[in-house]
C-alpha cells in the first residue's frame, strides 16, 4: 500500500481543516488508514482522524481544531496499521479556504432595486470576520448566456443592483462566495443558490 498523491490540506481558519490524498489502488480509507495530527506545541497531544473514501483510491479527512492562529503548525502522520506511509506538516494560515456565506436572500420589495443580503460565515471574534470580500453570481434559468459576476469589495455582506439591469418577467438565481486577501485564500465554495422572479415596471416612454 502506497500513497500516490500526498495529502494536501486546507483550513477554514476556524475549526476544521480538510486533507485529501490518493492511494495507489482502491482503498477502504476508514478501516485501513489513520491520519494523526498534532499541533507543534509543548503541551499538545496527537489526535486521530478517521478518513472517508473520496472516489475509489481517494481519501479525505476532516481534522477538528479548537481554533486557529497564524503561528500554528501541525505535524501529520499517515498510518496503515503499524506502517508509516507518509509524514508531513501543515500550517493552516498558509492554506485557507473560507467557509461559504449563508442565508442568501433577495429582497425585491425595495422600489426597483434588488437587495441581496447574506451572512458572514465567521463569528465576530474570528480574524477573517472583518477581512472577507465576496463575489455574487447571478444567472438566468432561461438563458445560459445571461450570467454575471458582481465583486463586493466592501465588508458589508450585501449588494444592491437596479432590477432593470436584469430582464423582466423571467426567473433568476443567485449565489455568493467569499475570499480573504490578507491570507491570500482560495475562494470558498458557493453558497446554496436562491431563486426569484424578476419583474419591474418599464419606464413610460414619451414620444
Amino acid at each position: 500500500m502506497k500513497v500516490l498523491q500526498e495529502p494536501t490540506c486546507v483550513s477554514d481558519y476556524m475549526s476544521i481543516s480538510t486533507c485529501e490524498w490518493k492511494m495507489n489502488g482502491p482503498t477502504n480509507c476508514s478501516t485501513e488508514l489513520r491520519l494523526l495530527y498534532q499541533l507543534v506545541f509543548l503541551l499538545s497531544e496527537a489526535h486521530t482522524c478517521i478518513p472517508e473514501n473520496n472516489g475509489g483510491a481517494g481519501c479525505v479527512c476532516h481534522l477538528l481544531m479548537d481554533d486557529v492562529v497564524s503561528a500554528d503548525n501541525y505535524t501529520l502522520d499517515l498510518w496503515a496499521g503499524q506502517q508509516l506511509l507518509w509524514k508531513g506538516s501543515f500550517k493552516p494560515s498558509e492554506h485557507v479556504k473560507p467557509r461559504a456565506p449563508g442565508n442568501l436572500t433577495v429582497h425585491t420589495n425595495v422600489s426597483d432595486t434588488l437587495l441581496l443580503t447574506w451572512s458572514n460565515p465567521y463569528p465576530p471574534d474570528n480574524y477573517l470576520y472583518n477581512h472577507l470580500t465576496y463575489a455574487v453570481n447571478i444567472w438566468s434559468e432561461n438563458d445560459p448566456a445571461d450570467f454575471r459576476i458582481y465583486n463586493v469589495t466592501y465588508l458589508e455582506p450585501s449588494l444592491r443592483i437596479a432590477a432593470s439591469t436584469l430582464k423582466s418577467g423571467i426567473s433568476y438565481r443567485a449565489r455568493v462566495r467569499a475570499w480573504a486577501q490578507c491570507y491570500n485564500t482560495t475562494w470558498s465554495e458557493w453558497s446554496p443558490s436562491t431563486k426569484w422572479h424578476n419583474s419591474y415596471r418599464e419606464p413610460f416612454e414619451q414620444h
Partner: antibody
Framework: EVQLLESGGGLVQPGGSLRLSCAAS????????MAWVRQAPGKGLEWVSA????????YYADSVKGRFTISRDNSKNTLYLQMNSLRAEDTAVYYC?????????WGQGTLVTVSS | QSVLTQPPSASGTPGQRVTISCSGS????????FNWYQQLPGTAPKLLIY???HRPSGVPDRFSGSKSGTSASLAISGLRSEDEADYYC???????????LGGGTKLTVLG
C-alpha cells in the same frame, strides 16, 4: 463559565508536604492541558509545572524538579500538585491555570506558607 | 534572573498610549510566540494577549501585542485608571521544556 478552584494550601514546616487540588468546571477538562503557577509575596509570577490533557507528558521548573509531582484525574475534573520537601522559598500563592496556547483561565489561588 | 526582561515600571496619564517591552536574551529561541497577562491589585492574573497579537474575547481592543524576533511589546492606548496593574509577558521555551515569564512591569496611571 470556566471555573478553577484551588484548595489544600496552609502552613507547613520546612521539609513537610502538602497536596494542592484544583477543581475545574465549565469546560471539558479532559481536553485541556493544565498548569500550576506560583507567586511569592510581593514577587512576580513563576511557572511551576504543566501536564498534557491525558497526563502522558509532564514538565517541571528546575526549582521544583524532584520535589513536586503534578497529576490529574479526568474522571473527577481535578488537577493536583503534590509538594514534598518544602522549603521557605516555596512560600507563595499557588494558581491553577488552564492551558490553551497560554494560561487562558486562572483560579483565585491558594496560599502555601512554609515556616517553622 | 528571568530569561525575559521587562522594565520594572511604566507610567502614563489617562488617554495616553503606553508600551511595555519584553526582551529575550540573545540566545533565546525566537520560534515561540508571546503571551501577556494583566494582574490587577489583589486579584489573580488574567490573559490579555496570546500568540503574539491575539486578544481573547472580552479583552478591549485598546490592548494590542506585537512581536519582533526574540522580543515582544504590549501597547495600551486610551489609558484608563483601571489599567493600573502588573503586566507579565511569557512564552513556552522548548529548549527548557517549560514556560518562562518576565519579571513583570508595574503600570501606574498618573493624575
Amino acid at each position: 463559565e470556566v471555573q478553577l478552584l484551588e484548595s489544600g494550601g496552609g502552613l507547613v514546616q520546612p521539609g513537610g508536604s502538602l497536596r494542592l487540588s484544583c477543581a475545574a468546571s465549565g469546560f471539558t477538562f479532559s481536553r485541556h492541558a493544565m498548569a500550576w503557577v506560583r507567586q511569592a509575596p510581593g514577587k512576580g509570577l513563576e511557572w511551576v509545572s504543566a501536564i498534557t490533557s491525558s497526563g502522558r507528558s509532564i514538565y517541571y521548573a528546575d526549582s521544583v524538579k524532584g520535589r513536586f509531582t503534578i497529576s490529574r484525574d479526568n474522571s473527577k475534573n481535578t488537577l493536583y500538585l503534590q509538594m514534598n520537601s518544602l522549603r521557605a522559598e516555596d512560600t507563595a500563592v499557588y494558581y491553577c491555570a488552564r492551558v490553551h496556547r497560554a494560561f487562558d483561565y486562572w483560579g483565585q489561588g491558594t496560599l502555601v506558607t512554609v515556616s517553622s | 534572573q528571568s530569561v525575559l526582561t521587562q522594565p520594572p515600571s511604566a507610567s502614563g496619564t489617562p488617554g495616553q498610549r503606553v508600551t511595555i517591552s519584553c526582551s529575550g536574551s540573545p540566545l533565546f529561541p525566537d520560534s515561540g510566540s508571546f503571551n501577556w497577562y494583566q494582574q490587577l491589585p489583589g486579584t489573580a492574573p488574567k490573559l490579555l494577549i496570546y500568540a503574539d497579537s491575539h486578544r481573547p474575547s472580552g479583552v478591549p481592543d485598546r490592548f494590542s501585542g506585537s512581536k519582533s524576533g526574540t522580543s515582544a511589546s504590549l501597547a495600551i492606548s486610551g489609558l484608563r485608571s483601571e489599567d493600573e496593574a502588573d503586566y507579565y509577558c511569557g512564552t513556552w521555551d522548548y529548549s527548557l521544556s517549560g514556560y518562562v515569564l518576565g519579571g513583570g512591569t508595574k503600570l501606574t496611571v498618573l493624575g
